[in-house]
């Protein structure tokens, strides 16, 4: 590894996973690097191997336990290090004191399904995955619908400012194919960010009844 602009960013999924990305301009692609987690008040340590995701960035997931186990709390601080092998020794490239509940990014919502569909409306539900019970109802969602001839980036964002795991889409066009995505974010955390978008759910509105105005 060589000197250059370096960035080390990690997020906690609120249960048992810390995902990290390390980028370093000019670092060698074949360098063996890992992230090491050292909590301040727990007996375990954890390591993951950084794998290349682009020319100058690497990523890995620290698996802290079973997916739904609550491995960290709001008072925990985890010292995270990037270590790279240089010859026979490991060298620390980056370090941070990570406050998990200040750096949250939840898993993408799952189990999207059409509850009810009509000509102009569609009711969709979903579930959140591996989200801490600490949040209670302090979550918000964003949703978007892909219309024919448009891109996801053009889709207007619908904001749900509460823990509401369903939406009723209205003013849809009859007999039309749509796709729908949703993402989630806790209200807590200075550096908290949106989850990835869910897998898209495809649905089709019902055709208008023959002989009726649409």
């Amino acid at each position: 590894a060589v000197n250059g602009t370096s960035q080390f960013t990690c997020f906690y999924n609120s249960r048992a996973n810390i995902s990290c990305v390390w980028s370093q301009d000019g670092a060698l692609q074949d360098t063996s690097c890992q992230v090491h987690a050292w909590p301040d008040r727990r007996r375990w340590n954890q390591t993951c191997e950084l794998l290349p995701v682009s020319q100058a960035s690497w990523a890995c997931n620290l698996i802290l336990g079973a997916p739904d186990s609550q491995k960290l709390t709001t008072v925990d601080i985890v010292t995270l290090r990037v270590l790279c092998r240089e010859g026979v020794r490991w060298r620390v490239m980056a370090i941070q004191d990570f406050k998990p509940f200040e750096n949250l990014r939840l898993m993408a919502p799952i189990s999207l399904q059409v509850v009810h569909v009509e000509t102009h409306r569609c009711n969709i539900s979903w579930e959140i995955s591996q989200a801490s019970h600490y949040f209670e109802r302090h979550l918000e969602f964003e949703a978007r619908t892909l219309s024919p001839g448009h891109t996801w980036e053009e889709a207007p964002l619908l904001t749900l400012k509460q823990k509401q795991e369903w939406i009723c889409l209205e003013t849809l066009t009859p007999d039309t194919q749509y796709e729908f995505q949703v993402r989630v974010k806790p209200l807590q955390g200075e550096f908290t960010t949106w989850s990835p978008w869910s897998q898209p759910l495809a649905f089709r509105t019902k055709p208008a009844a023959l002989g009726k105005d649409t």
């Epitope: 010292t79 490991w90 620390v92 490239m93 370090i95 004191d97």
Partner: nanobody, 126 residues
Framework: QVQLVESGGGLVQAGGSLRLSCAAS????????MGWFRQAPGKEREFVAA????????TYGDSVKGRFTISTNNAKTTVYLQMNSLKPDDTAVYSC???????????????????WGQGTQVTVSS
Amino acid sequence: QVQLVESGGGLVQAGGSLRLSCAASGSIFSLNTMGWFRQAPGKEREFVAAISRSGGSATYGDSVKGRFTISTNNAKTTVYLQMNSLKPDDTAVYSCAASAAVGWTTRWSTIDFDSWGQGTQVTVSS
């Protein structure tokens, strides 16, 4: 490579003060953090204090908090350790260390530091 040379150690009575200096030379542009560790006979090396090269952040080991102060000169080439209210337990070889790791922690470890000085002996008599 970075070269570190410590000075200022010596014999002092309990309750007294000493000021250690560590001069860095070589590839110091790569350094982000300077620190002090100490090792008493028969004991593991212990973290004492660290300071960011910018001087904006400093942290201390529990056993020296409130008594020791770490600082740097304007050129960021020398780091100082002002040691007040010294106790016999502070007797050790004090080593300066330098780290190129990007970022900051309050929990520095020996693994974080790439370059080390030879050390200077501090003896506190009762």
